[in-house]
């Protein structure tokens, strides 16, 4: 083992932006940071055969298999895949290491298999074996974490039944509101499954794996906080565990906490209490109400009472199936070109939704914010004043929801013209949709005031570009106007725009644009 490591094998994952078959390359594209594949000498192999850790790749992902050799000078190499030789161009990095790369763009089943790399340097020969397979993500799951009490201990265990095994972390915050945002300095993260410090203001548990990250907040009633104007509501599905924490701080230990469901004390075994002294010698008590697997009859008002604080309640609603409640009627908006505006959807949902905003076949990330009344809101402001159709889509394990929005931007028309041997057409995308006039320019009417009404055909909104309407007007050519200049004008409440067209023989037409506000 004293001759290790002379070579380093790495996997580089790329952000997809191209498609091709595997190709040998010395300069891969922009990428994520390299992952060490720990090339180890293959036991019981004749010669110097190194084996990289197996590589699992998502379908359509782009990767680079890379080998770094600490052998400057002349090196030659050859890739072999499925009995075919692939060309190989080594280069040297700043540190004089030989670099050999194999880029696999848009991974497919045909590109999975064993990649053999033969390297010949002045000093030694190396054979490196990479095994690349397609990751079976169909079997992957990421479930929202839930809480369990640790046996014989005052501690909570966070569980997420996910594949692959997720990394579980507790996210703790002792501040209020905005300062408990994920990246705030007030937030402390603990990458462990068991939590003993249960007195904090805000406690969440998150689980993450290749599919993403899911979090569950420990539902808390704080008797020292002013109650919300609307009763806090907690939704659960039948069979899920219920956890509610009641927290109270008092100048001394002379107070107690109790839980009631619909005015009946909770049964023993459905609650446990913890207490501690805070830094200023006040007493903090917390009382957990929990049901390991809820049924419909666990629905109701859970009230936490204290001998020294006003009691507070939460409504627990047990549902058979998840839901998304929101109005799905489409909404149309009309705004000025520089007006600040955001689309917003207010909804109530359980379990928490995953959502996207879509415009012009492009998806945008979707943020949700919880409101005090149990509703959540998602806003989209990144429309860059582009008119058209915007779609909000939300889903959870049990429900789906889609809502359509149309955005119209008030602006004066812009006219485009085209002509053929038999007709001239003008198009405009202004809003409100413009009206059209055609005028003939002649010796009698050098200012083009002679209106043309014959042979004009207006089509309102004949072409819908991602919800953006385009209006057009067509003038059929007649002997009376052939050889003349004609002017088409589009006008709406914000202004007028015109194009002048010379109606002669077919071919490229000269267009003169007039802008009249």
């Amino acid at each position: 083992n004293q001759d290790l490591p002379v070579i380093k094998c790495v996997l580089i994952n790329h952000k997809n932006n191209d498609s091709s078959v595997g190709k040998s390359s010395s300069y891969p594209m922009v990428s994520e940071s390299p992952e060490d594949l720990g090339c180890a000498l293959r036991p019981q192999s004749s010669g110097t055969v190194y084996e990289a850790a197996a590589v699992e790749v998502d379908v359509s992902a782009s990767i680079t298999l890379q080998v770094l050799v600490d052998a400057p000078g002349n090196i030659s190499c050859l890739w072999v895949f499925k009995h075919s030789s692939l060309n190989c161009q080594p280069h040297f990095d700043l540190q004089n290491r030989g670099v050999v790369s194999m880029v696999i763009l848009k991974m497919t089943e045909t590109q999975a298999g064993e990649y053999l790399l033969f390297i010949q340097s002045e000093a030694t020969n190396y054979t490196i074996l990479f095994t690349v397979s397609i990751r079976n993500t169909l079997l992957y799951t990421l479930r929202r974490p839930y809480f369990r009490k640790m046996e014989n201990q005052d501690a909570l265990v966070c569980i997420s039944e996910s594949v692959p095994e997720p990394i579980v972390e507790w996210v703790l915050c002792d501040s209020q509101g905005e300062s408990c945002k994920e990246e705030s300095p007030a937030v402390v993260k603990k990458e462990e499954k068991v939590l003993h410090e249960l007195f904090g203001t805000d406690i969440r548990c998150c689980a993450r794996n290749e599919l993403g990250r899911e979090c569950t907040r420990l539902f808390t009633i704080d008797l020292n906080q002013t109650p919300q104007t609307t009763l806090p509501q907690l939704f659960l599905k039948v069979g899920e565990p219920l956890w509610i924490r009641c927290k109270a701080v008092h100048v001394n230990h002379g107070f107690g906490l109790t839980w009631e469901l619909e005015n009946k004390a909770l049964e023993e075994g459905n609650y446990f209490e913890m207490s501690t002294y805070s830094t200023n010698r006040t007493m903090i008590r917390i009382l957990f109400a929990f049901v390991s697997s809820v049924a419909r009859n666990d629905t109701g008002y859970y009230t936490c009472s204290s001998s020294k604080h006003p009691s507070q309640s939460a409504l627990v609603t047990i549902v058979e199936k998840g839901f998304i409640n929101a109005t799905n009627s489409s909404e149309d908006y009309e705004i000025d070109q520089y007006e600040e505006f955001c689309f917003s959807v207010r909804f109530k949902a359980y379990p928490q939704i995953r959502c996207t905003w879509t415009f012009s076949r492009k998806s945008f990330p979707c943020e949700q914010k919880g409101l005090d009344n149990g509703y959540s809101i998602s806003k989209f402001c990144n429309h860059k004043h582009q008119p058209g159709e915007y779609i909000f889509h939300a889903e959870n394990d049990d429900a789906q929801f889609t809502k359509m929005f149309t955005l119209n931007i008030r602006r004066k028309p812009q006219v485009l013209a085209e002509a053929s041997a038999s007709q001239a057409s003008c198009f405009s995308d202004g809003y409100p949709l413009p009206s059209w006039t055609w005028k003939k320019c002649s010796d009698k009417s050098p200012n083009c005031t002679e209106e043309i009404t014959e042979g004009v055909w207006n089509r309102k909104a004949n072409r819908k570009v991602f919800g953006q309407w385009v209006s057009s007007s067509t003038l059929n050519m007649s002997e009376a106007i052939k050889g003349f200049l004609v002017k088409c004008c589009a006008y709406n409440s914000l202004g007028t725009s015109c194009e002048t067209i010379l109606l002669n023989s077919p071919g490229p037409f000269p267009f003169i644009q007039d802008n009249i506000s």
């Epitope: 002379v6 380093k8 770094l68 600490d70």
Partner: antibody, heavy 118, light 106 residues
Amino acid sequence: EVQLQESGAELVKPGASVKLSCKASGYTFTNYWINWLKQRPGQGLEWIGNIYPGSTIINYNEKFKNKATLTVDTSSSTAYMQLSSLTSDDSAVYYCARRVVYLYFDSWGQGTTLTVSS
Amino acid sequence: QIVLTQSPAIMSASPGEKVTMTCSASSSVSYMHWYQQKSGTSPKRWIFDTSKLASGVPVRFSGSGSGTSYSLTITNMETEDAATYYCQQWSSKSPTFGGGTKLEIK
């Protein structure tokens, strides 16, 4: 076991030259870069340069280009560093170290103390 | 040349205490390596590729960071951990070292 054995302490006069040695054992000498580093008392480490015994490719830190000369003798698996035109600024502990492909130094010599004094 | 700045230059900790020292690079580097050096001895490789422990290094040591900011942490300081720790990068043509953090026992 990988070992780098450096030559003993040197006391030399200003203006003179000195040749330090580093004998490698326990691995294939021609497969790894030998690096030389300088450490003044109570100070950090400075990289002087490196040499690849397999093809005698040499790199120098710009600062030491006119100060150090690196050579190897593959038959005895020994690397050498000659320091010329010595001044009191060259008084330091000099280490040879083996570089691995991960770009760190995995094995170090015990160091040679060089004192330049009249 | 990439300059590495280690802080603090000197620190002391009691046994059992958590210790964190940092290494800041003047421009972004791919990996950071760490060495431990005790008085009168040569440096020992300690952490490589930012977070991998060299063989024989106790698991109470850990390394992390990216870009221009890296750190070495000891979860439970022990007396044998008293030493000077150097960070090192080789993302540029020449490798450079930080000035070292001297960790003393309280």
